[in-house]
Amino acid sequence: MKVLQEPTCVSDYMSISTCEWKMNGPTNCSTELRLLYQLVFLLSEAHTCIPENNGGAGCVCHLLMDDVVSADNYTLDLWAGQQLLWKGSFKPSEHVKPRAPGNLTVHTNVSDTLLLTWSNPYPPDNYLYNHLTYAVNIWSENDPADFRIYNVTYLEPSLRIAASTLKSGISYRARVRAWAQCYNTTWSEWSPSTKWHNSYREPFEQHHHHHHHHHHH
């Protein structure tokens, strides 16, 4: 039994780091393998992660962590019974994939403005809480070409757009994802999408020229 592709890990910079690797043949990851991980710090205990299968020869492990600071470094040991297959280390702050934002809501009660709000996926005591920026994706269910991205570069988890920038009388969906420049993170996964019906009533004089108001961002 050998490791074909060494473990690579990403951290949510809060409580979970996910490590993936490939073996040289079909493997029952949960029964045959164990990933031991330990924070390089005083009093830190070794923890054992039981991997799950991720395709025939692929394994994935979710490492649980109480907290994280920038300087953290973990030792990783991949064992098959008494045999050490691989030894490495992992610095969470250098491989961050933020948690996905949640609770995306579209407020349509103001006739000419759409307000999209969502929740920051981190608690206030986490460094990323004040360092996330977002991308909001809005698309039409009826028209695949009507697809736009709004970059939210301020900290507030909200976006206001004029309802007139979208077509009236059709359904739209939105989703949001996050990243943090400070740790040069990857993008988070997209949040679950939310759907609404855009029923903006355009003034009569604009009605015949409504195609001029569709801006793609």
């Epitope: 409580s15 710090f41 005083l42 109480d66 907290d67 600071v69 206030p124 005591d125 400070c182």
Partner: antibody, heavy 116, light 112 residues
Amino acid sequence: EVQLVQSGAEVKKPGATVKISCKASGFNIKDTYMHWVKQAPGKGLEWVGRIDPTNGYTIYASKFQGKVTITADTSSNTAYMELSSLRSEDTAVYHCVSRRPWFAYWGQGTLVTVSS
Amino acid sequence: DIVMTQTPLSLSVTPGQPASISCRSSQSIVHSNGNTYLEWYLQKPGQSPQLLIYKVTNRFSGVPDRFSGSGSGTDFTLKISRVEAEDVGVYYCFQGSHVPYTFGQGTKLEIK
């Protein structure tokens, strides 16, 4: 041996500012969060705030916001807490504590007395 | 802010007898990572506090096994199975799950 050694007792007049230090040995403060805890005479423990020494990210309890500034110098492995606009109710022992992720190591405490 | 309420506020126990201190939080102290950062500290006279229990039930290194922690949700308990003279001092519960972190008001343990 792990130790947090705090600066000595201070006596200050109302309105003054005081800065107390907490020097760590036996570990690197970059590997922990450094917290400060207040204990007024004959009273209980009160969490003041904390810093991540690597990036300087601080959080304070709301009642200490504007009163306290926590800083850290990783080159000297030292955390600091500054108290401004001192009043009699700031008289207390202030403890520095490292948390990773619980308060395993405490400084001996620094008594700050505010008296005219 | 989460309020941590300890009962009783003082306790007088005969050596060799058990003691129990309760700590109730005003709301859930489960962190968004799923852990409950409820800790117990003992401050002996003239000393800085020392860690006894972390994450509700885990005894810190070097803490005698007569100390045990239990509880969940908002109700937590520290038990000393057989009190010894060296156990005197003030016991504090603490929640480190939600900012601002908060201590209980303390329970003073005396020996009869």
